[in-house]
């Protein structure tokens, strides 16, 4: 598989087949499950150097593994996009032998004199063809050669063949399936040959070609796949419930911020609450997590106001749960990114000398920005996209607050709306889909570069819209939510989150 | 064919020093362990160490009765196996070979004809 | 290191017999399902020669009479039914560990 190791080296050589027998439209769905999969590498922080080859006839050699841009993969992807169908139209032929060698010429090395760490750079090549070579001769001999030169299967004690990956994407009206299979690699429990069929849902077959066990720890990453769970999709989201004897219980969400900790928001305990009876559950586990404290934070106080006839205050409206245990990471529970912290810094492809102020401006804008939050619906995990109002639209969401229950008697809306916190709801952009309950504590995130980065804790809404869980389908305009910045908490986050590795800046 | 030709040897005094050849040809050198074994006048086969493949970086090992005064290195370009030997005694009096070690199952498959180091004043 | 103890250290047979001859380790040499011992032979004035690797594989161009059998700690060399050229000295080698190690060797005599 492609072991996705940011710490790690590798070459990816993309060979794409633009002879007679392929069709335009076919190489340009080739391209695109190529951009895809350089996208989704990328994501990963994983930063390979790309080899990319179209050929017919005669190869053509885009972008070589030596050159300096080779391992951006924007820059990549810009050349793959420019490259037409009709670049190989005069030699039509197919000479896959000769493409898989200039697939070699970029592996050697001059004078046979191997540079530094090349036995610890992995090589993946995807083919993408229909397998109807009619020139050259047999491109396998030129898979031994590749094996050969990269020491592969020669060294019973160290075979190395987790150093060489052919995946082979048969595409074309018709594919000598035969052919195909013998260019692939052959690993046990592993699949390196995929159909025309497969490439419809991408993330399947990414699915089954990439290794992420080096990078489980890595926040904010999904996993789409149609086979994947809930939790596949929201592996951060974590259950909260907190029994009261004789009070029933309450329900809140949450999010994994690192292996002991889940960012909540405070409202969802009394500080009468014991450990013992506040149940976490994550990854949709049965079992509960036993939890060593939760930590409040300290400018947190909901009876803050009420001599000032505000009956409720949720300003600074977060806290953490400390585990008992550590998590353990996997592709069902890992963590979700925090603003201003290098990993963040990192999922955003951002330089390393990127500022907090710099990762605030990329990630909350003063503009509408596209967000989501993530409800339980009928025991089902659902995205909601909402739009959080950070522009023009700022100051009529945040005045909406009003109309909420207890309200209704505050003289300056700032009272109750703090710069701690993000609105969202209302029907301009768009609808928002509004929060209920239940949702509480859980993350508001915005998502980008195919990554989830948390920028804000549910605390608060103004219409109640989920009358018996369910959400009502009309809802009025003034009908906002109220989610605390983690901007605006940072000081806090870093002091309690201080041993967690996550290098805040 | 396979070819291992050892050169070097002859009479030394103790406390001196010597090298050793073994020139290949017939396979592609650098993907192969190659080894040094001795064999002192009707005495047993002792393995001396050996030179890794290209993957180790030709990184050598040794056996503990020489480390620290015999040296293996190789030189790709001209597929031949050196051993240096220094502070020579008289125990180190024997036949050497060299032998390819085969990394596809770890075994000495090809060895040379040997050569005789007498270390004697 | 590993120790490699062949026993016996001289064996008599005539030829047409069953000669067997043990090497035992000191400790494991196997090593994720292979068993990483090698028997050699030698004969007066001449080079080893690669007779069995990896516990049981008949090196080509040796003759079918020879084979190896053994894991872990305790291995033997067959030669089923002995020839005249068999007279030789048998040494086992292990390959699992650095360093090699040879065993002290078993001198096969031919009546």
């Known amino acids: 598989k492609i072991v996705l190791d940011p710490s790690g080296s590798m070459n990816i050589y993309l060979v794409l087949d633009g002879s007679d027998s392929i069709g335009a439209s076919n190489f340009t769905g080739a391209k695109k499950c190529l951009v895809n999969l350089i996208e989704k590498v990328a994501s990963y922080g994983v930063k390979p150097r790309y080899g990319l080859v179209t050929y017919a006839t005669y190869p053509k050699i885009w972008v070589k593994v030596s050159e300096a841009d080779s391992s951006n993969a924007d820059w990549v992807t810009k050349q793959l996009n420019e490259i037409n169908y009709e670049d190989h139209k005069l030699k039509s032929g197919t000479n896959t032998k000769k493409a898989l060698q200039a697939v070699y010429s970029m592996m050697s090395w001059p004078d046979d004199v191997p540079p530094e760490g090349w036995n610890r750079t992995r090589h993946v090549i995807i083919l993408m063809t229909d397998g109807l070579h009619n020139m050259g001769g047999d491109p396998i001999t030129v898979i031994d050669e590749i094996r050969d030169l990269l020491y592969i299967g020669k060294d019973r004690k160290n075979p190395r063949e987790d150093y060489l990956d052919v995946y082979v994407f048969g595409v074309g009206p018709l594919v000598n399936q035969v052919n195909i299979n013998a260019l692939a690699s052959k690993k046990d429990n592993e699949q390196h040959v995929f159909k025309v069929k497969d490439m419809e849902n991408l993330e399947d077959v990414f699915y089954q070609m990439i290794d992420e066990s080096q990078s489980l720890s890595l926040c904010g990453m999904v996993w789409e796949h149609r086979k994947g769970t809930d939790y596949h999709k929201q592996p951060w989201q974590a259950k909260i419930s907190v029994i009261r004897p004789s009070k029933g219980h309450e329900s809140c969400m949450g999010a994994v911020v690192s292996e002991y900790f889940v960012l909540t928001a405070a409202h969802c305990f009394t500080v009468d609450d014991k450990e013992h009876s506040i149940k976490v559950s994550v990854g949709g586990e049965k079992r509960d997590l036993e939890i060593e404290v939760v930590l409040f934070h300290p400018n947190y106080n909901i009876n803050g106001k009420k001599e000032a006839g505000i009956p409720e205050f949720y300003d600074y409206d977060v806290a953490l749960i400390k585990l008992k245990n550590k998590l353990k990471y996997g592709q069902t529970i890992r963590p979700i990114c925090l603003p201003c912290t290098e990993g963040t810094t990192r999922a955003l492809r951002l330089p390393p000398t990127t500022t907090c102020q710099q990762q605030k401006e990329e990630l909350l804008p003063a503009q509408d920005i596209k967000a989501l939050f993530v409800s339980e619906e009928e025991k089902k995990l659902t995205r909601k996209e909402v739009y959080i109002k950070n522009g023009d639209k700022k100051g009529s969401c945040e005045r909406d607050a009003q109309y909420a229950p207890g309200y209704d008697k505050v003289k300056d809306i700032s009272e109750v709306v703090t710069p701690r916190f993000l609105c969202t709801g209302g029907v301009s952009p768009y609808a928002d889909p509004n929060t209920c309950r239940g949702d509480s504590g859980g993350p508001l995130i915005v998502h980008k570069r195919s990554r989830f980065i948390q920028v804000g804790v549910i605390s608060w809404g103004v219409v109640d819209v989920c009358k018996n869980q369910k959400r009502q389908k009309q809802v009025p305009a003034h009908a906002r939510d109220f989610h605390i910045n983690l901007f605006q908490v940072l000081p806090w986050l870093k002091e309690k989150l201080q041993d967690e590795d996550l290098g805040f800046l | 064919e396979v070819q291992l030709v050892e050169s070097g040897g002859g009479l030394v005094q103790p406390g001196g020093s010597l090298r050793l050849s073994c020139a290949t040809s017939?396979?592609?050198?650098?993907?192969?362990?190659m080894s040094w074994v001795r064999q002192a006048p009707g005495k047993g086969l002792e393995w001396l160490g050996f030179?890794?493949?290209?993957?180790?970086?030709?990184?050598?090992e040794y056996a503990a009765s020489v480390k620290g005064r015999f040296t293996i290195s190789r030189d790709n370009s001209k597929n031949t196996l050196y051993l240096q030997m220094n502070s020579l005694k008289t125990e180190d009096t024997a036949v050497y070979y060299c032998?390819?070690?085969?990394?596809?199952?770890?075994?000495?498959?090809?060895w040379g004809q040997g050569t005789l180091v007498t270390v004697s004043s | 290191e590993i120790v490699l103890t062949q026993s016996p250290a001289t064996l008599s047979l005539s030829p047409g017999e069953r000669a067997t001859l043990s090497c035992k380790a000191s400790?494991?040499?196997?090593?994720?399902?292979?068993?990483?011992m090698n028997w050699y032979q030698q004969k007066p004035g001449q080079a080893p020669r690669l007779l069995i690797y990896?516990?049981?594989n008949l090196e080509s161009g040796i003759p079918a009479r020879f084979s190896g059998s053994g894991s872990g700690t305790d291995f033997t060399l067959t030669i089923s039914s002995l020839e005249p050229e068999d007279g030789a000295t048998y040494y086992c080698?292990?390959?699992?560990?650095?360093?090699?190690?040879f065993g002290q060797g078993t001198k096969l005599e031919i009546k």
């Open positions: 400790q494991s040499v196997d090593y994720d399902g292979d068993s990483y």
């Open positions: 080698q292990q390959s699992n560990a650095d360093p090699y190690t």
């Open positions: 990896a516990a049981s």
């Open positions: 032998a390819r070690d085969n990394p596809g199952y770890y075994a000495m498959d090809y």
């Open positions: 017939g396979f592609t050198f650098r993907d192969y362990y």
């Open positions: 030179s890794r493949h290209r993957v180790y970086g030709y990184t050598p």
